[in-house]
């Protein structure tokens, strides 16, 4: 049986080397010689020799300094032969325990930590933590038992401990109230780790904490009074720039300024924010009155995008907008001025007076009336007064200057100010009808057939309006009844129906025809007829020759 | 002279509400996170609530959240609890304690709410 | 049941010295150097007597002390006088939202 007692072996021994560990024994020695030997990690497999036997007193010995941290456990088996060679015992596991020294300091697992808290934190508040490792053994010693401290604060301001940190785990928190990112917007800590439970090797490393911005800074008018003018009636023009500053972080929704006027109960001005400087643009967002109103007071408040996250005064400015006088133009009143005239009227005579006002009652100014589109040169106008009268006749069945029996005049009024200003204003004539338009046959020109002739319709146009057109009455003249007839197609006599008494010879005739209206205005028309070579409708007219008896009837 | 004066306690039925004010004087109030801590008859000190010093931030015990809110007002040096819902188990000497670090210093001398029926 | 633990009652005589507990976790009083002594006279608003272990705010007598092994804080008095007798309560800071535990306090009879 072997003899082996438990064999530890510190690391990092001084020497001398070799060094006695135990004596291993087999109780087989009673018996006769036993020679000792052994094989393993450490003995015959790399690491090779660190340990060896004495052959025959079986003193284990170790030949170098171990170092736990590489190997922390050695296995061996041990074996005892008699002189013959032969195995007097069976081969015995030995293991040996590399005892821990504290030979590691601690190392952080970064040179520099990185973390984050909101300005404003309670104690408390979580920031960051670091974390430390050590290798020597934590299961039995505590050579690796880390204790945290911050070491130091950079700025110690507004507290020379604003941080802490857990001495076991490495969180490091608020500890102080007063975090203020526009006064001190990082920290940086020396933070060290230290072994033995903070007693024994340490190691540091930094902890950059950055403050993080709340909006806890209103955005403040400087200056908070502002004078500003403006041309009246005119929209989207810049009266004045408003400044502030905000000690927040630029380009955040906590800096970002926003603009409000509080006694603007018209929507007449509007603020936008200038998103590269935060200024505050104020705009006319309709034109002024002048004659209304000269001067405008307004109190304009900022806020930011997001709200404030503390209780803070929001700042206000004063801008005083002078309205500027424009020169305005005159305003015809009504802008559309209609009137009914007969298209008799006299020539020369006055149909109306229109005029304009003056917007600009602080100016004294005279009005000139000029006409400025009259297609059919139909009016003339009194420059000083605005009566409109006739300079020709009027008909109201010119249908290219007159739609819808109304003619339409553009008169303009300019005022003597500086610059001139010039207004518009529309007359509408509205010209009622006078019969002075007989019936007329369409068409005038008319084709039948030599052979079973097909009758023709002829429509009667008047271009006057009701009284003065249908029923309207068609009689055949000079002798034109011989060889046609006539009969109202419709009940309203608005077209009739010629067709020849007779078969007529191929050529042409003159039909004349008087029409009259339903007033009695008539008028004798003269229809061309043309007797074609063919059968029925007179669709392709082939004519033969003329015949050169001249007027046939 | 550092100075905190509560007031605005007295008797209430449970269910009902009743806001606390604390006084501020002798230091810079804004610089100072600011806690409501109470005590029931015979019993110890328990911490009810914390408000930052800008007013941003704010803690409450579980015992007393969703019912009390804390506020302040730097401009006029006043600490504020806004207690709801208030029950039997809330009666006690409230006090208002201002903490630079984590220790209370200064305190007020208290003021009592009784929750009874 | 409080967060930190001390004795409900200690006594001692004129002149005698006491110590008085205060047994937190590994997350309180183990962590931090942030523990702090409240003395409380009846009818009375506490009053801060050390801070940060074992700081004395000005005024208060060096007859108190403080200090701290493991997550076990200790305030002592020495020489005792009749003015000590009055309830003690200890406090520590811990991380989270409860940023500060009370001790179920310790009334302190002076013989």
């Known amino acids: 049986d072997w003899v082996i007692p438990p064999i530890s072996c510190p690391e990092n021994e001084k020497g001398p080397f070799p060094k006695n560990l135990v004596q291993i024994k087999s109780n087989k020695d009673k018996e006769g010689k036993v020679f000792y030997s052994i094989t393993g990690q450490g003995a015959d497999t790399p690491p090779v020799g660190v340990f060896i036997i004495e052959r025959e007193t079986g003193w284990l010995k170790v030949t170098e300094p171990l170092d736990r941290e590489r190997i922390a456990t050695y296995t061996l088996f041990s074996h005892a032969v008699s002189s013959n060679g032969n195995a007097v015992e069976d081969p015995m596991e030995i293991l040996i325990t590399v005892t821990d020294q504290n030979d590691n300091k601690p190392e952080f697992t970064q040179e520099v930590f990185k973390g984050s808290v909101m300005e404003g934190a309670l104690p408390g508040t979580s920031v960051m933590e670091v974390t430390a490792t050590d290798a020597d053994d934590d299961v039995n010693t505590y050579n690796a038992a880390i204790a945290y401290t911050i070491l130091s604060q950079d700025p110690e301001l507004p507290d020379k401990n604003m941080f802490t940190i857990n001495r076991n785990t490495g969180v490091i928190s608020v500890v102080t109230t007063g975090l203020d990112r526009e006064s001190f917007p990082t920290y940086t800590l020396v933070v060290q780790a230290a072994d033995l439970q903070g007693e024994g090797l340490s190691t540091t490393a930094t902890a950059v904490i950055t403050v993080t911005d709340t909006n806890d800074n209103p955005p403040i008018f400087n200056p908070t009074t502002y004078k500003g003018q403006v041309p009246e009636n005119e929209a989207n023009v810049v009266i004045t720039t408003l400044k502030v500053t905000d000690a927040d972080a630029p380009n955040t929704p906590a800096w970002e300024a926003v603009y409000t006027i509080l006694n603007d109960d018209g929507g007449q001005f509007v603020v936008t924010t200038n998103p590269v400087n935060n200024d505050g643009i104020l705009k006319t967002a309709k034109g002024l009155d002048f004659e209304a109103k000269q001067q405008y007071i307004l109190h304009v408040a900022v806020t930011n995008v997001v709200p404030f996250e503390v209780s803070l005064t929001t700042s206000t400015a004063t801008v005083t907008v002078d309205v500027l006088d424009v020169n305005e133009a005159p305003i015809f009143v009504p802008p559309e001025k209609r009137v009914e005239v007969s298209e008799d009227f006299g020539v020369g005579q006055e149909i109306t007076s229109y005029t304009a006002q003056e917007p600009d009652t602080f100016m004294e100014q005279k009005i000139t009336y000029r006409i400025w589109r009259d297609t059919a040169n139909w009016l003339e106008i009194n420059p000083d007064t605005g009566a409109i009268s006739t300079r020709a006749e009027l008909d109201r069945e010119d249908f290219e200057h007159v739609k819808n029996s109304t003619y339409t005049a553009l008169i303009i009024a300019t005022d003597n100010g500086s610059p001139v200003a010039t207004g518009t204003g529309t007359l509408l004539l509205i010209l009622s009808d006078v019969n002075d338009n007989a019936p007329i046959p369409e068409p005038r020109t008319i084709f039948f057939c030599e052979r079973n002739p097909k009758p023709q319709v002829i429509n009667i146009i008047d271009a006057d309006l009701p009284p003065n057109t249908s029923p309207f009455t068609a009689e055949l003249t000079h002798g034109a009844s011989a060889n046609w007839t006539i009969q109202y197609n419709d009940p309203t006599q608005e077209s009739i129906i010629l067709k020849p008494k007779m078969a007529l010879e191929v050529g042409d005739y003159k039909i004349n025809l008087k029409l009259m209206d339903n007033q009695n205005k008539d008028q004798v028309t003269t229809l061309e007829v043309s007797v074609c070579d063919c059968e029925g409708a007179a669709g392709v007219c082939r004519k033969a020759q003329p015949v050169e008896a001249g007027l046939q009837i | 002279e550092v100075q905190l004066l509560e007031s605005g306690g007295g008797l209430v039925q449970p269910g009902g509400s009743l806001r606390l004010s604390c006084a501020a004087s002798?230091?810079?109030?804004?610089?100072?996170?600011m806690s409501w801590v109470r005590q029931a008859p015979g019993k110890g000190l328990e911490w009810v609530s914390a408000?930052?010093?800008?007013?941003?931030?704010?803690y409450y015990a579980d015992s007393v959240k969703g019912r009390f809110a804390i506020s302040r007002d730097n401009s006029k040096n006043t600490l504020y609890l806004q207690m709801n819902s208030l029950r039997a188990e809330d009666t006690a000497v409230y006090y208002c304690?201002?903490?630079?670090?984590?220790?209370?210093?200064?305190w007020g001398q208290g003021t009592m709410v009784t929750v009874s029926s | 049941q409080s967060a930190l633990t001390q004795p409900a009652s200690v006594s001692g005589s004129p002149g005698q010295s006491i110590t008085i507990s205060c047994t937190g976790t590994s997350n309180d009083v183990g962590a931090y150097n942030y523990v702090s002594w409240y003395q409380q006279h009846p009818g009375k608003a506490p009053k801060l007597i050390l801070s940060e272990v074992n700081k004395r705010p000005s005024g208060v007598s060096n007859r108190f002390s403080g200090s701290k092994s493991g997550n076990t804080a200790s305030l002592s008095i020495s020489g005792l006088q009749a003015e000590d007798e009055a309830d003690y309560y200890c406090?520590?800071?811990?991380?989270?939202?409860?940023?500060?535990?009370f001790g179920g306090g310790t009334k302190l009879t002076v013989l």
């Open positions: 002798g230091f810079t109030f804004s610089s100072y996170a």
């Open positions: 304690a201002g903490s630079r670090t984590v220790q209370f210093d200064p």
């Open positions: 408000i930052s010093g800008s007013g941003g931030s704010t």
């Open positions: 406090t520590s800071y811990t991380m989270g939202s409860t940023f500060m535990l």
